[in-house]
């Protein structure tokens, strides 16, 4: 049978040739009648036999972390039959490990980032180097992990590569640090190999630190004639922390928040102060207000670091504006009667400089001939007023400061012009008519009716009457229908067109107002001859019949 | 899982070179006991193995193709390459890589392959 | 070089039926240097049978590999649809080879 023992032939070995052991067959007497050969691969180009004493020899270099075994095949052949001695055999040459090869860490680059203020004993990441050495002979690759550089804040465990915080860190003194590992294998004892990495471990921001304003007094100014809601300056607190945890919200102290606010603007992390509600200087020209400013996120455990808010004065001074005049109402009604004479009361108007100087007031009229005013807002009539022509006026009345032209106010002004009794009743419109010469007594030829232009708080109310000498003439005669109108009858029987072809009525007409007002009104009555079915008329004056809408021939 | 991805030309002209390129994710090619393989297939043939590179740069050619044949190693970018020059079209072939387990010799895996063609 | 010598070249056979491949050596090569590989069109082979005998991860034991020395066997107990493909030996000696390969096609 075969006899040989493991195979083992050291890596990386130099020399030319190398003995790795002997292959023989126990028939071999040691008197060379057998011939050892070798097949496979690797035969003849890496491992070599001695064909006569079946000793193996490796001829070339050999590295175990590329090919760690080889498979051959063994033959022993009888020179002198040719036959084979034992059966074709196959046996194994294992290469040996060397430590040969250093600790790599693989997965480089490393980072890790860890809470600033994290305890002793967190964990920020684990580093791996991988020894492409043989794990299973002796210490080769097994690996100490050690810490070249990053004491005293941090640590790593020897046999896990795991990295520890040693020492509380503070971001706001130190962001990042570079912290070096080394790797060595055979435990770290004499003529190991070494391999490092660098590990960048960023401390991420906690919110440790709370706002604080820079400024113990901020001064502001606003003006007067800001509206609400304007922004009158800014103010700043600094917050050593970063992100969102540098996000601060600003308020004003409950007491202090009437006429001012602080709203916050995220983007920039500024108060802004803005007017709450308008300020007038002649009032109050300054104002004194504390504003307070916090973090917008505080987790609970971070409380402790927040205890007490910052807090700044801020003092606001009211600017001055030359503020327009102030009229006492914000429009005037006068009431005057009409026919007044020119000069005429009609009333007083007053405006006041809101502002300290107290400038005095110059007062007019926009667009008027028919009022004046003077400097001490006396309001007059340049003009009589006739109400019928015009029964209001609407005006404006401005008021400019003497020492400041450009400081204007203007107000309406209603002047309502009262009526009196200045017009007489008169016919609503004018009246023609007529009479047949057949006509009987008593006929009703025609109803007036009047108007007045003036304006009645009662109700108009009109008397009618025919003059003195129509009524003495007793052709027609007239009746008040007690409703404004009146009706004209005839008084006699039978006109004559020839003797007699028209007559002018004089009828008086009263108004009820005080003093009463008359007017005479003429009635124009042409005599027809009227034909005896009423229909063919023939008068003085063709045109009142085809006026009126009657057939002529 | 280590996966292999071949990259280069589809087309290549008569006595130029060919060059692929062989893209290992999902392992390192600094593994030991590894080779890195290029086989390829003739349209309708059998395979043919062209070699092998182990990571330090140590390489293994098929005798037959050993004059006209580089393999190259660049561990930075996890890839090895192939150079066939003078091609003709002979060549014309899909080229698979593939990783060989190097006490063992069985190839596994492999990648996809990519179809050159030696043309002009 | 070692020639890898696969027959036959095309087997006919249907779904549930078995398949005998053989790859004959032209000299011997460890059984712990042979391969089996299956091909389907258009896809890259992949490891069946290594180490003469050992399935590899994933491979159905309906597969099964054996022999030594020059004359090695992949069977397949009962074909599924799914294995009609090219199946190619590979030994690892000096330097490596693959066989022609052996095609089974329906029947």
């Known amino acids: 049978g075969w006899v040989w023992n493991q195979f083992f032939v050291p890596e990386e070995m130099n020399t030319t040739s190398h003995h790795i052991g002997q292959l023989r067959s126990d028939l071999d007497n040691g008197n060379n009648s057998f011939q050892y050969k070798l097949l496979g691969a690797g035969a003849g180009s890496t491992f070599i036999i001695d064909e006569r004493t079946g000793d193996i020899y490796a001829i070339q270099k050999l590295d175990r972390e590329e090919r760690s075994l080889y498979i051959l095949r063994a033959q022993v052949i009888d020179i002198a039959t040719g036959r084979a001695v034992e059966p074709e055999s196959e046996f194994v040459i294992k290469v040996s490990d060397i430590n040969d090869n250093e600790p790599k860490f693989l997965d480089e680059p490393y980072e890790a980032i860890v809470p600033e203020m994290s305890p002793e004993g967190t964990l920020v990441i684990q580093v791996t180097a991988s020894d492409a050495d043989d794990p299973s002979s002796g210490n080769n690759a097994r690996l100490l992990y050690s810490l070249l550089q990053g004491q005293p804040y941090f640590s790593v465990e020897p046999t896990t590569g795991v990295i520890r915080i040693s020492s509380k860190m503070d971001r706001e003194l130190q962001d990042e640090y570079w912290v070096i590992i080394q790797a060595k294998d055979m435990i770290g004892q004499p003529g190991a190999l070494s391999g490092t990495t660098s590990v960048l471990i960023k401390l991420s921001d906690v919110n440790d630190n709370k706002p604080i304003f820079k400024e113990s007094l901020y001064r502001l100014t606003v003006s007067e004639s800001a509206p609400t809601g304007t922004s009158i300056g800014t103010i700043m607190a600094y917050d050593n922390d970063i992100g969102e945890n540098a996000e601060m919200d600003y308020s004003i102290e409950e007491d202090d928040s009437q006429t001012f606010d602080i709203i916050t603007n995220h983007e920039t992390q500024e108060g802004i102060v803005i007017l709450k509600k308008k300020v007038d200087f002649e009032h109050q020209n300054h104002y004194g207000i504390r504003a307070k400013v916090k973090n917008h996120h505080v987790p609970e455990q971070l409380m402790k670091y927040h205890t007490e808010a910052s807090t700044t004065f801020i003092k606001i001074q009211v600017e001055d504006v030359d503020e327009p005049p102030l009229f006492l109402l914000p429009y005037y009604v006068f009431e005057v009667f009409e026919e007044t004479p020119q000069g005429s009361f009609v009333g007083v108007v007053s405006a006041t400089d809101p502002d300290n100087r107290k400038s005095p007031i110059r007062y007019s009229i926009t667009r008027s001939k028919v009022f004046n005013i003077n400097d001490n807002g006396t309001i007059t009539t340049s003009n009589s007023l006739d109400r019928e022509i015009s029964a209001w006026y609407n005006l404006s009345i401005t008021a400019t400061e003497k020492y400041n032209i450009e400081q204007i106010s203007s107000i309406p002004l209603y002047v309502q012009v009262l009526n009196i009794n200045d017009h007489a009743p008169e016919f609503s419109q004018y009246y023609e008519t007529y009479v047949c010469e057949n006509a009987g007594s008593g006929q009703v030829i025609q109803t007036i009716s009047a108007v007045d232009r003036d304006e009645s708080i009662e109700e108009h109310h009109f008397y009618f009457n025919l003059s003195v000498e129509d009524t003495n003439n007793s052709s027609f005669t007239i009746i008040d229908n007690q409703d404004n109108t009146a009706v004209i009858l005839t008084n006699r029987t039978g006109f004559n067109l020839q003797e007699e072809p028209v007559f002018y009525i004089s009828i008086l007409i009263a108004d009820n107002g005080i003093p009463s007002l008359t007017s005479t009104n003429t009635l124009t009555i042409h005599v027809c001859d009227c034909g005896d079915s009423g229909s063919t008329q023939t008068c003085q004056y063709q045109e009142l019949v085809l006026s009126m809408g009657f057939k002529t021939e | 899982q280590v996966q292999l991805q071949e990259s280069g030309p589809g087309l290549v002209k008569p006595s130029q070179t060919l060059s692929l390129t062989c893209t290992i994710s999902?392992?390192?090619?600094?593994?030991?006991?590894?080779?890195w393989s290029w086989i390829r297939q003739h349209p309708g043939k059998g395979l043919e193995w062209i070699g092998y590179?182990?990571?330090?740069?140590?390489?293994y050619y098929n005798p037959s193709l050993k004059s006209r044949v580089t393999i190259s190693v660049d561990t930075s970018k996890n890839q090895f390459s192939l150079k066939l020059t003078s091609v003709t079209a002979a060549d014309t072939a899909v080229y698979y890589c593939?990783?060989?387990?190097?006490?063992?010799?069985?190839?596994?895996?492999w990648g996809q392959g990519t179809l050159v063609t030696v043309s002009s | 070089e070692i020639v890898l010598t696969q027959s036959p070249g095309t087997l006919s056979l249907s779904p549930g039926e078995r398949a005998t491949l053989s790859c004959r050596a032209s000299?011997?090569?460890?059984?712990?240097?042979l391969a089996w590989y299956q091909q389907k069109p258009g896809q890259a082979p992949r490891l069946l049978i290594y180490?003469?005998?050992s399935r590899a991860t994933g491979i159905p034991d309906r597969f099964s590999g054996s022999g030594s020395g020059t004359d090695f066997t992949l069977t397949i107990s009962r074909l599924e649809p799914e294995d009609f493909a090219v199946y190619y030996c590979?030994?690892?000696?000096?330097?490596?080879?693959f066989g022609g390969g052996t095609k089974v096609e329906i029947k």
């Open positions: 593939a990783r060989v387990n190097s006490n063992y010799g069985w190839f596994d895996p």
């Open positions: 999902g392992g390192s090619i600094s593994s030991g006991g590894y080779y």
């Open positions: 590179i182990f990571y330090s740069g140590r390489t």
């Open positions: 000299q011997s090569v460890s059984s712990s240097y």
């Open positions: 180490g003469a005998s």
């Open positions: 590979q030994q690892y000696g000096s330097s490596p080879t």
